[in-house]
């Protein structure tokens, strides 16, 4: 299996903002890549976002998605918008090479991602 | 040395309050115990808060210090307040039996606090 | 590492008092802990008998209360047992044991059997 | 005084088996529970304190749970030298009490 690292930990901001680098360590020059963020709590696993991606291109996730990213060699940046208290939780990055042959596949331990909610402004009167 | 358990991990809520139980493993019933809060950052520990207490009594921090706690048996009920992102670290509980004799000492493998500042709000017009 | 060994005779007569002793080395009694009796009849359970403390106050089970004194010796770093008037029903292997103050056990002498009977 | 009512008060198992004794306290002792092994013709040895804690050089396979009046002792791979008799005890209160033991054998 291919290596694939990732914090441990990362705060969201308290506009529900979390970024962090998805590092894979590739046994070769793949031209298309595959990044899959899944969330793991509670035991369940669902999967948050994926994009496939042209070595030298952006990442390109659908337009509702919550996950924008840049790709820079082996590196990708994520980051995961619009988090609350309840998104607390385990975000695994995982990697696939999809083009040239083989097909590799790279599974990381996992980003503990820790979102607290924001105290409401007082009114304005 | 007395064993001492503390949680892993505690966020701070928005307003810049955190919890936690400080449990020791007592070997019988003191009736003075001093609990340590002490910050691991960088390298460096500092002492944060102190309280000595009689056994079945509240425990009383100094009027000027940022913490405040109950006692039930061997659990040590700690908040810590006025957090800001820059105390994120390492918070360390210190259990000392004080009386009777002989003095016993635990320390904690500490709770590490995160702490987000909010976003300020918008002014009103 | 503490050491406790009781002492004492192994047989009493009715109606008289046994007296037991507990040499303890590696640790001096008038430092800390509790210094206690427990006893154990034949095939039963254990029961406490009462302590001495390090500052030398002493705690009894009040079941017994009216015949133990308990006491020390702080230059020989020993304490003793007294129970009085025995009958049948006081044989049994006696143990002492150090605890923190209403702790558990946590260092025990290996007894001593004593039988009361004519 | 606090009862310690301890059941079985003996049992029979085998090499390998997951053995459990349980302890009632009469009235609320918190945690402050010591479990002890006694040999015969030795004396009791500490195992377990304050409810979960092992005691030091006590091998993992002994545990303890509980609070407040119902504990419970557990020997999660029994092993032929754990052949003995298990006491619980409360310390929360004087006269300090035992339960009366459950006397492990092997099958």
């Known amino acids: 299996a291919m290596h694939v690292a990732q914090p441990a930990v990362v705060l969201a901001s308290s506009r529900g903002i979390a970024s962090f680098v998805c590092e894979y360590a590739s046994p070769g020059k793949a031209t298309e890549v595959r990044v899959t963020v899944l969330r793991q709590a509670d035991s369940q696993v669902t999967e948050v976002c994926a994009a496939t991606y042209m070595m030298g291109n952006e990442l390109t996730f659908l337009d509702d998605s919550i996950c924008t990213g840049t790709s820079s060699g082996n590196q990708v940046n994520l980051t995961i918008q619009g988090l609350r208290a309840m998104d607390t939780g385990l975000y695994i990055c995982k990697v696939e090479l999809m083009y040239p042959p083989p097909y590799y596949l790279g599974i990381g331990n996992g980003t503990q991602i820790y979102v607290i909610d924001p105290e409401p402004c007082p009114d304005s009167d | 040395a007395m064993h001492v358990a503390q949680p892993a991990v505690v966020l701070a809520s928005s307003r810049g309050i955190a919890s936690f139980v400080c449990e020791y493993a007592s070997p019988g019933k003191a009736t003075e115990v001093r609990v340590t809060v002490l910050r691991q950052a960088d390298s460096q520990v500092t002492e944060v808060c102190a309280a000595t207490y009689m056994m079945g009594n509240e425990l009383t921090f100094l009027d000027d210090s940022i913490c405040t706690g109950t006692s039930s048996g061997n659990q040590v009920n700690l908040t810590i307040q006025g957090l800001r992102a820059m105390d994120t670290g390492l918070y360390i509980c210190k259990v000392e039996l004080m009386y009777p004799p002989p003095y016993y000492l635990g320390i904690g493998n500490g709770t590490q606090i995160y702490v987000i500042d909010p976003e300020p709000c918008p002014d009103s017009d | 590492q503490v050491q406790l060994q009781e002492s004492g005779p192994g047989l009493v007569k009715p109606s008289q008092t046994l007296s037991l002793t507990c040499a303890v080395s590696?640790?001096?009694?008038?430092?800390?802990?509790?210094w206690n009796w427990i006893r154990q009849p034949p095939g039963k359970g254990l029961e406490w008998i009462g302590y001495?403390?390090?500052?030398?106050?002493?705690y009894y089970n009040p079941s017994l209360k009216s015949r133990i004194t308990i006491s020390r010796d702080t230059s020989k770093n020993q304490f003793s047992l007294k129970l009085s008037s025995v009958t049948a029903v006081d044989t049994a292997v006696y143990y002492c044991?150090?605890?923190?103050?209403?702790?558990?056990?946590?260092?025990w002498g290996q007894g001593t059997t004593v039988t009361v009977s004519s | 005084d606090i009862q310690m009512t301890q059941s079985p008060s003996s049992l029979s198992a085998s090499v390998g088996d997951r053995v459990t004794i349980t302890c009632q306290a009469s009235?609320?002792?918190?945690?402050?529970v010591a479990w002890y092994q006694q040999k015969p013709g030795k004396a009791p040895k500490p195992l377990i304190y304050?409810?979960?804690y092992r005691y030091s050089g006590v091998p993992s396979r002994f545990s303890g749970s509980g609070s407040g009046t119902d504990f419970t002792f557990t020997i999660s791979s029994l092993q032929p030298e754990d052949i003995a008799t298990y006491f619980c005890?409360?310390?929360?209160?004087?006269?300090?009490?035992f339960g009366a033991g459950t006397k492990l054998e092997l099958k």
């Open positions: 304050s409810t979960s």
């Open positions: 009235q609320n002792v918190g945690t402050y």
């Open positions: 590696g640790y001096s009694i008038s430092s800390g802990y509790y």
């Open positions: 005890h409360q310390y929360d209160t004087y006269p300090l009490t």
């Open positions: 001495i403390g390090y500052d030398g106050s002493n």
């Open positions: 044991a150090r605890n923190y103050y209403s702790g558990y056990f946590d260092s």
